[in-house]
Each structure stands twice: as C-alpha cells, then as structure tokens.
C-alpha cells in the first residue's frame, strides 16, 4: 500500500472548552446569633476547585470550614459546598462601627468569584418600650390613636396589638388600622372597642409586652322629649302643671355625662272657676186655673251654669189646689194643652 | 352635623407667612385627626400635615417641614395652619379633613403666593 | 416616603361601562388605603376606606379590592353623576395620594 492514507497530526489538539468563572448555588445569608448559640455561614458553589470564606477582610483558617463535594441533582454537576461557625465571642471581639461580616470565594481554573457579603449580628431586644400606649376615654364614634415605640432590637422587633389578649387583625376588622410606625388607629370607636389594648413587639431574642392601655369608650346623655304637661293644680284659678324628662335618649354610659339642664319645669296655670246654676226666686202664683190649681215657675238663671258649673237640682214649676178639692174633677181633660206641665212637675196633685 | 370650615386664605409674598384656620363642628376636635391638604392649581391632592390632639401627635410632609406648623386650640374646636416662608409652588386650594380615611372635608380656601 | 401609582391617569367610558382603576403602592401598606371622589370646584368625596370598606351612603356599584400591594377601585356600572377624579390614598406611613384618575365621557 501506499502512505496516502496515512494521517498527519496537528501541532496541537483544539483544547476542551474554557471551564467557566464558579457560580454560587447558595450564597451566605445574613445571621444574627441568639443568646451564644454560634450561627452557621454556608456556600455552594459549581464548578469549583476550592471556596473559603473571608470574613471582615481576613482569610477564615483552613481549619475552621467544613467541606464537601457533590452531585447537583438537577444538573448533574459536581458541587462543592463549604461552611463555617461565627460564635458571638467573635462577633463582640470586631470592633468600630461596620457589622461583622463574611463572604465566600470560589476558585475554578478560570478564576475567582466572590459571593454576597452576610452580616452576623448579635440578637438582642432591649426590656424597655421608647413609647407605651396610654390609656384613655374617648366619646362614641370617635377616632382613638394608641401610639407604640417598641424596644430597639436586632432584628428589628415585628409589632402586633392585643385587644383584651386577642391579636387585631385589620383584615378582619376594618375599623382598626395599624400603621408602619405601629400605632394602632380605631377609625370610629365603638362601645365593644371598650377594652384593655397591649403593643407586642417581638423578634427572634424575646417577645415583649407594653403596659396595657384602657380604652373606655363612653355615651354622654341626651334627653328624651318632655312629656305631655300635668293638669293645673288646681281645678278652679291660680295652679301649677309640670311636664318632666329623662336622661335616657342615651343613657350615659362608662361614664359618659349626665345631661345637662332641668329634668322638670314647672309653670303657672290659671283654670277659669267652673260656676254651679242656681235657681231663681219663685215667680208669684198663678190665678185660680178651671182646674182649681195655680202654679208658680223659677229659672236655673241665678246664675245659669258656666265652664262645667253644675245644673240646678229640683223643679222648674210648682202647683197646688186653690180651692180646697171643692172643683169638679171632670173639667181637666186630656186635651188640655196644660196637661204635660202638670205631669212633668213631679210633686203636683189633682183633686 | 359634622362641618369644617376653613378660613384664613388670601394673597401673600414670597417669604410672607399666613395662618388658615380649620373650625370644627359636630364632633369633638380633640378625639379626632385633622389633616392639611391642598390642591394646586389644575393638579392632584398633596397632603401637608396632621394633628391628633389627644396623643399630641403631629406630622409633616417634607415639602413643608420646618415652614408650617399644625397645632389645635381644642376649646374652640378649631385646628390651625401657621404657613411661614412661603413660596409660590405653596399656592393652592388648601382643605382641611377630618379622620385618617378622611370622611369629612372642608370647602377650601385659597392661597396664592405671588409677588 | 409610600409612593402611590395611580393608572390610567384618564380615561374614557360611557354610562354603564364597568370602570376599573388601579394604585400599586411602592411597599407594603396593609389595608391602609382610601379612595375618593372629585368633582371641578368642590372638596374630595371619601368613597372607600380599609382597602375595601364601602363609606356609608355610597352606592353600592363603587368596590374596592386589594391583591398584595395592588389597590383597585371598580364602578360596576357608570352613572352620569361619576364623572369626575378619583384619587387613591395611603395612610399607613405618611399620608401620600395617587396622581388621579381622570373619567371622562366617551
């Protein structure tokens, strides 16, 4: 055969693709030691040769990290993951004003790659609150603000509010409003908002409680209308009537104030004096009738009734014989136009 | 009825100074927020400033710090505006409202800063 | 300070038109949010307050709505009497409002 076939080699191989700069699968995340538990700082990173962590600007000794090498799971990739221990010694050991901080570098064969810086701080929450609630009474329907300065914490302290122990949702109940520098505002107080409020403030260290502020909310009184107005005293000239009201359109409530002003008035009256009738004197006799009576009249005219005055009492005619019974009977007839005057006089006789 | 009446607008130079006047009626001034806010000229709603006079609570917004003073006189159930320094971008409709979700606003009053 | 966007800054709808505008606060605000009505030469109008309360005597075809820190203001069905501003409000920090919202007729 011939050498045609045979195959030249080049000066150099084409070289396998550039490894890429580490790329942090999990950087270090801020940390705040709670009482001396040290906190742990981690990394991951891909591709990596070595990763070490620098904290505060120094190199942290080979020796404190814990490393190790692994399958990501979702790319397949080998994973090197490092971490370390801050203890609060540490931490209290830096001095000046920047936060203990750390980061991870991460080393491949193109490079380093640094990843965020975390911060470690100390977890505390001071005992004392900077502003507590206090306590007050508020007229119905009124806005009530309670203001609440929680103690200075590492983290900063969440706050929530108690009403009576149960924690205010505004979600729930929209007449409540917290605001972001956590004072609590009741938009139109309500009798049920009548109740002890507490400021909560809390973080990882502590929880701490306020002191605890009544809000009582009150009803000032207002007065029914007045009442129809009595009968004068008196039935007859100069009297007194008197009409009243109550406190109780509302009543006052927690304390509310009584209403102001008279519960009663009283005012003169004058009734016109009602006058009884009386009669008249009898009008003289009457001659000697056919039927051998005579008759006599009076009015109720001395003087008539008046204003409800009572009507007189008796007869308006009187009548009697004239002649001793010596008159014939047969004269009075039924047709006498008379006759009724005699009858309606109850105390009058024939013979 | 609740009403609120502001007063106290007008004409004034720059570095001049005015005093608005919010009166309140119907309700009790001192268990109530009252709030500063003004409208210029063809523009939207700025708020200035609020009192709450129960917890002596009063709060500015940067554009007026240090130049108006909110204060209340809760005998006379009226809230105030003292406005010092002024400038013409002060120039506006100034109202006055009652509640943090403001229920009840007064008419305006105008105040025009101009030389 | 709480910025409030307030979108569109004006739009055009007919009567009955389901009319919806919206404010995205710039951090959280809870429910601290009220929204008003203005009409040419007179004071603001309280129409919803805690995100979603309706204000008493309101109609009932005004609503409110909250999604996170995205406030809305909805007209269910448009009434001559609703043309006008309306203005979004926060006051869970320092009080800030919307730019407006300007509804005009188609």
């Known amino acids: 055969g011939t050498d045609s076939g045979s195959e030249v080699l080049p000066d150099s191989f084409p070289s396998a693709p550039a490894e890429p700069l580490p790329y942090f699968l999990q950087e270090p995340q801020d940390a705040y030691i709670v009482k001396n538990k040290p906190v742990e700082l981690r990394c991951r990173a891909f591709p990596a040769t070595q990763i070490y962590f620098k904290c505060n600007g120094e190199w942290v000794s080979q020796n404190d990290h814990v490393t190790q090498e692994g399958l990501d799971e979702a790319t397949g990739l080998r994973v090197r993951e490092v971490q370390i221990e801050v203890s609060r010694q540490q931490v209290e050991e830096l001095f000046g004003l920047e936060d203990y901080w750390c980061q991870c570098v991460a080393w491949s064969s193109a490079g380093t790659t640094k990843s965020r810086r975390a911060y470690v701080r100390i977890a505390y929450l001071r005992k004392n609150f900077d502003q507590e609630p206090l306590g007050k009474e508020v007229p119905l329907d009124h806005e009530v603000l309670l203001q609440c300065r929680p103690p200075e914490g590492v983290p900063v302290a969440e706050v929530e509010w108690l009403k009576n122990e149960d924690v205010i949702d505004p979600t729930q109940d929209t007449n409540f409003l917290l605001t972001i520098d956590h004072n609590l505002i009741i938009r139109q107080a309500r009798l049920s908002d009548t109740a002890n409020y507490t400021c909560v403030a809390k973080n990882i260290v502590a929880k701490r409680r306020s002191t605890t502020a009544t809000v009582i909310v009150y009803v000032n009184g207002g007065w029914s209308s007045w009442a129809e107005w009595s009968p004068c005293s008196n039935r007859c000239g100069r009297g007194w009537q008197k009409r009243t009201r109550t406190c109780t359109n509302p009543a006052p409530l927690n304390g509310g104030a009584f209403c102001e002003g008279q519960a009663f008035q009283k005012t003169a009256c004058t009734t016109i004096c009602p006058v009884d009738g009386a009669w008249t004197e009898w009008s003289k006799w009457s001659a000697c009738s056919t039927e051998c009576a005579h008759w006599r009249s009076r009015e109720c005219m001395a003087p008539p009734p008046q204003n409800g005055g009572r009507d007189c009492s008796g007869t308006l005619l009187d009548s009697k014989n004239c002649t001793d019974g010596l008159c014939m009977q047969n004269k009075k007839t039924l047709s006498d136009p008379n006759s009724h005057l005699l009858e309606a006089s109850g105390d009058a006789a024939l013979y | 009825e609740v009403q609120l009446v502001e007063s106290g607008g007008g004409l004034v130079q720059p570095g001049g100074s005015l005093r608005l006047s919010c009166a309140a009626s119907g309700f009790n001034l001192y268990y109530s927020s009252i709030h500063w806010v003004r409208q210029a000229p063809g523009k939207g709603l700025e708020w200035v400033a609020s009192?709450?006079?129960?917890?002596?609570?009063?709060s500015y917004a940067d554009s007026v710090k240090g130049r108006f003073t909110i204060s209340a006189d809760t005998s006379k159930n009226t809230a105030y505006l003292q406005m010092n320094s002024l400038r013409a971008e002060d120039t506006a409709v100034y109202y006055c409202a009652r509640g943090y979700a403001m229920d009840y606003w007064g008419q305006g009053t105008l105040v025009t800063v101009s030389s | 300070d709480i910025q409030m966007t307030q979108s569109p800054s004006s739009l055009s709808a007919s009567v009955g038109d389901r009319v919806t505008i919206t404010c995205r606060a710039s951090q959280s605000v809870s429910s601290a949010v009220a929204w008003y009505q203005q009409k040419p030469g007179k004071a603001p109008k309280l129409l919803i307050y805690s995100a979603s309360s309706l204000y008493s005597g309101v109609p009932s075809r005004f609503s409110g709505s909250r999604s996170g820190t995205d406030f809305t203001l909805t007209i269910s069905s448009l009434q001559p009497e609703d043309f006008a501003t309306y203005y979004c409000q926060q006051h869970y920090g320092l009080i800030t409002f919307g730019q407006g919202t300007k509804v005009e007729i188609k």
């Open positions: 009192i709450y006079s129960y917890s002596s609570y009063t």
